[in-house]
Amino acid sequence: FKVATPYSLYVCPEGQNVTLTCRLLGPVDKGHDVTFYKTWYRSSRGEVQTCSERRPIRNLTFQDLHLHHGGHQAANTSHDLAQRHGLESASDHHGNFSITMRNLTLLDSGLYCCLVVEIRHHHSEHRVHGAMELQVQTGKDAPSNCVVYPSSSQDSENITAA
């Protein structure tokens, strides 16, 4: 399978909410012993391999933001920890996987990575990620709502297997 990033750039005004999205593409193993570990984290642009460095999002680590569920299931982070930080990650039946960030500040600007790991009995079989940039703006040049910029077809299926 692959991870697509429908939008490579999100430009939002301060105080707005934004939902960053990744999508699982291609054949997905639906065996009874297969689950999917999905999470989000921040990274930096200047790396040899995008998304290899893992930084917290609003002090929450990739472990705190993870979902771990079966292939047929929808899921979302229900624990108070994420919601207290204005964050919620979610996954639906159609392969869409997102993180919602509420009340954006300039400090939220940066590179965000989604990670999907196919797990078979607690062991990783396949690992892919996608990257996108969030720019939070303030002042007269800031848009009134979030503006999203589609990925190029090459970027939208950007995949790195570990």
Partner: antibody, heavy 122, light 112 residues
Framework: EVQLVESGGDLVKPGGSLKLSCAAS????????MSWVRQTPDKRLEYVAT????????YYPDSVKGRFTISRDNAKTTLYLQMSSLKSEDTAMYYC???????????????WGQGTSVTVSS | DVLMTQTPLSLPVSLGDQASISCRSS???????????LEWYLQKPGQSPKLLIY???NRFSGVPDRFSGSGSGTDFTLKISRVEAEDLGVYYC?????????FGGGTKLEIK
């Protein structure tokens, strides 16, 4: 400090049922897979059940499949083992153990509780 | 099921000596993802097992560097370079590569 405290062990007759609990503290319980491991009177260790962090996946060896059910309540930070149709060979000390992982990829059973004793005898 | 066989059953040592425990699996425990999920645990008298080594040779946090793990495929070894009194107990190897996960029968490290 990671703490796992098992309870619910007892003397039970063959064919009976028992529910074990494992109260977890000192870590974010919902981030980790968990297992139950038992130690028989001859000191052999046997893994009896495992569950992933979200509770969507469980596994049992043939020796307990269909008789034991592992579950978890992430809000209560508690792991459970429901045991039914108990046999004398289920007599053991039962330990809960945390699965040390990264991205859901298993590394080891890094922390164990002190155990709760189950005796199946008529 | 993968059978894990430990030798010796009992290992009498003098304090300060080197100790070596062998663990052999009935089939390769290299997982399809390339990792070998072989661990070593120590159970001291009256206590629960404690993790020493994971993925063949990685020491768990707080484990002294006198403990080392090695091996590949089906043959694995735990070495204790200089045995101390606190090292006494039963050592178990464990494979987490293939379900069901299985333990070795244990090796009792005791004073000679």
């Amino acid at each position: 400090e990671v703490q796992l405290v098992e309870s619910g062990g007892d003397l039970v007759k063959p064919g009976g049922s028992l529910k074990l609990s494992c109260a977890a503290s000192g870590f974010t319980f919902s981030n980790y897979g968990m297992s139950w491991v038992r130690q028989t009177p001859d000191k052999r260790l046997e893994y009896v059940a495992t569950i992933n962090s979200g509770g969507s996946y469980t596994y049992y060896p043939d020796s307990v499949k269909g008789r034991f059910t592992i579950s978890r309540d992430n809000a209560k930070t508690t792991l459970y083992l429901q045991m039914s149709s108990l046999k004398s060979e289920d007599t053991a000390m039962y330990y809960c153990a945390r699965i040390y992982d990264y991205d859901g990829d298993y590394y080891a059973l890094d922390y164990w509780g002190q155990g709760t004793s189950v005796t199946v005898s008529s | 099921d993968v059978l894990m066989t430990q030798t010796p059953l009992s290992l009498p040592v003098s304090l300060g000596d080197q100790a070596s425990i062998s663990c052999r699996s009935s089939q390769s425990i290299v997982h399809t993802n390339g990792n070998t999920y072989l661990e070593w645990y120590l159970q001291k008298p009256g206590q629960s097992p404690k993790l020493l080594i994971y993925k063949v040779s990685n020491r768990f946090s707080g484990v002294p560097d006198r403990f080392s793990g090695s091996g590949s495929g089906t043959d694995f070894t735990l070495k204790i370079s200089r045995v101390e009194a606190e090292d006494l107990g039963v050592y178990y190897c464990f494979q987490g590569s293939h379900v069901p996960w299985t333990f070795g029968g244990g090796t009792k490290l005791e004073i000679k």
